[in-house]
């Protein structure tokens, strides 16, 4: 449920992205799939630090959602899980009325 691939761990180690405001983050990367296993178990919003959305493409045939929790652990969440869809919709609505959702693009080597 809480397994993360080596490539994700490497990305975390070498990433120099600065912290952002807002909880939703969209990344376009050239790396392959990050998530070995996905969980659909609900995580209350108050325990979530941020959510990374990795759109499909660039070597990964599926959309991936990575949740960073307030206890410093990380979990890949099934994008089809109803709760994460609802939560992202709420967060999108909030961000559109306050701050735009930050989008980061990593250059393809």
């Amino acid at each position: 449920m809480k397994f993360i691939s080596t490539s994700l761990l490497l990305m975390l180690l070498v990433s120099s992205l600065s912290p952002v405001q807002g909880v939703l983050e969209v990344y376009y990367t050239s790396l392959r799939c990050r998530c070995v296993q996905e969980s659909s178990v609900f995580i209350p919003r108050r325990f979530i630090d941020r959510i990374q959305i990795l759109p499909r493409g660039n070597g990964c045939p599926r959309k991936e959602i990575i949740v960073w929790k307030k206890n410093k652990s990380i979990v890949c969440v099934d994008p089809q899980a109803e709760w994460i869809q609802r939560m992202m919709e709420v967060l999108r609505k909030r961000s559109s009325s306050t701050l735009p959702v930050p989008v980061f693009k990593r250059k393809i080597p």
């Epitope: 178990v41 609900f42 209350p44 108050r46 325990f47 929790k69 307030k70 652990s73």
Partner: antibody, heavy 121, light 106 residues
Framework: EVQLVESGGGLVQPGGSLRLSCAAS????????MAWVRQAPGKGLEWVAS????????YYRDSVKGRFTISRDNAKNSLYLQMNSLRAEDTAVYYC??????????????WGQGTLVTVSS | DIQMTQSPSSLSASVGDRVTITCKAS??????LTWYQQKPGKAPKRLIY???ILQTGVPSRFSGSGSGTEFTLTISSLQPEDFATYFC????????FGQGTKLEIK
């Protein structure tokens, strides 16, 4: 009827340990996140720790990290708080509370009666 | 961490009075706020959740409002059983309680 009953409180010396228990009944215990909240005598409420459904995820307030451990036994419908390296400022009534929420409707709506922990030499 | 500033810390009022208690959050918590009533020696009792949704069984004289950083609990006509301490709780990011408002008989 939802019922939460805490036990295990008492007088302990600074640096000592104590294990609190919370027996739950009247609801499907494993369907809920659970929390411990404390209240120092004559003071306000303070969230202490939370745990997810299966015990795999735990969260703590900064002042108890590394000293307190929240755990649960779903087979026994029980929640626990292991408290080590106790300090005078940990003196409080400790409550357990339900706190799972999908839409906000269950956040800390059921509480136990509390158990008093006194840390003093 | 999100701080919750509750005011007033104490309040004297009479039966039949309209009373308002305020909670201010140090940052936006949207509507993720809960109100509790606590009587001496008892566990807190939830009155309102998600800012304005009344807990089942709670009298309609209690109401909540607000959004973002400012929230209020209103008791439209105080009854003798309402004299107690009231706490707010933010549940947007972990948990933080307000310091409490002690409502006393004038």
């Amino acid at each position: 009827e939802v019922q939460l009953v805490e036990s295990g409180g008492g007088l302990v010396q600074p640096g000592g340990s104590l294990r609190l228990s919370c027996a739950a009944s009247g609801f499907t215990f494993s369907d809920y996140y659970m929390a411990w909240v404390r209240q120092a005598p004559g003071k306000g409420l303070e969230w202490v720790a939370s745990i997810n459904y299966d015990g795999g995820d735990t969260y703590y307030r900064d002042s108890v990290k590394g000293r307190f451990t929240i755990s649960r036994d779903n087979a026994k419908n029980s929640l626990y708080l292991q408290m080590n390296s106790l300090r005078a400022e940990d003196t409080a009534v400790y409550y357990c509370a339900t706190e799972e929420d999908y839409d906000g409707s269950y956040v800390m709506d059921a509480w136990g009666q509390g158990t008093l922990v006194t840390v003093s030499s | 961490d999100i701080q919750m500033t509750q005011s007033p810390s104490s309040l004297s009022a009479s039966v039949g009075d309209r009373v308002t208690i305020t909670c201010k959050a140090s940052q936006n918590i949207n509507k993720e706020l809960t109100w509790y009533q606590q009587k001496p020696g008892k566990a807190p009792k939830r009155l309102i959740y998600n800012t304005n949704i009344l807990q089942t069984g709670v009298p309609s004289r209690f109401s909540g409002s607000g959004s973002g950083t400012e929230f209020t609990l209103t008791i439209s006509s105080l009854q003798p059983e309402d004299f107690a301490t009231y706490f707010c709780l933010q549940q947007s990011s972990l948990y933080t309680f307000g310091q409490g408002t002690k409502l006393e008989i004038k």
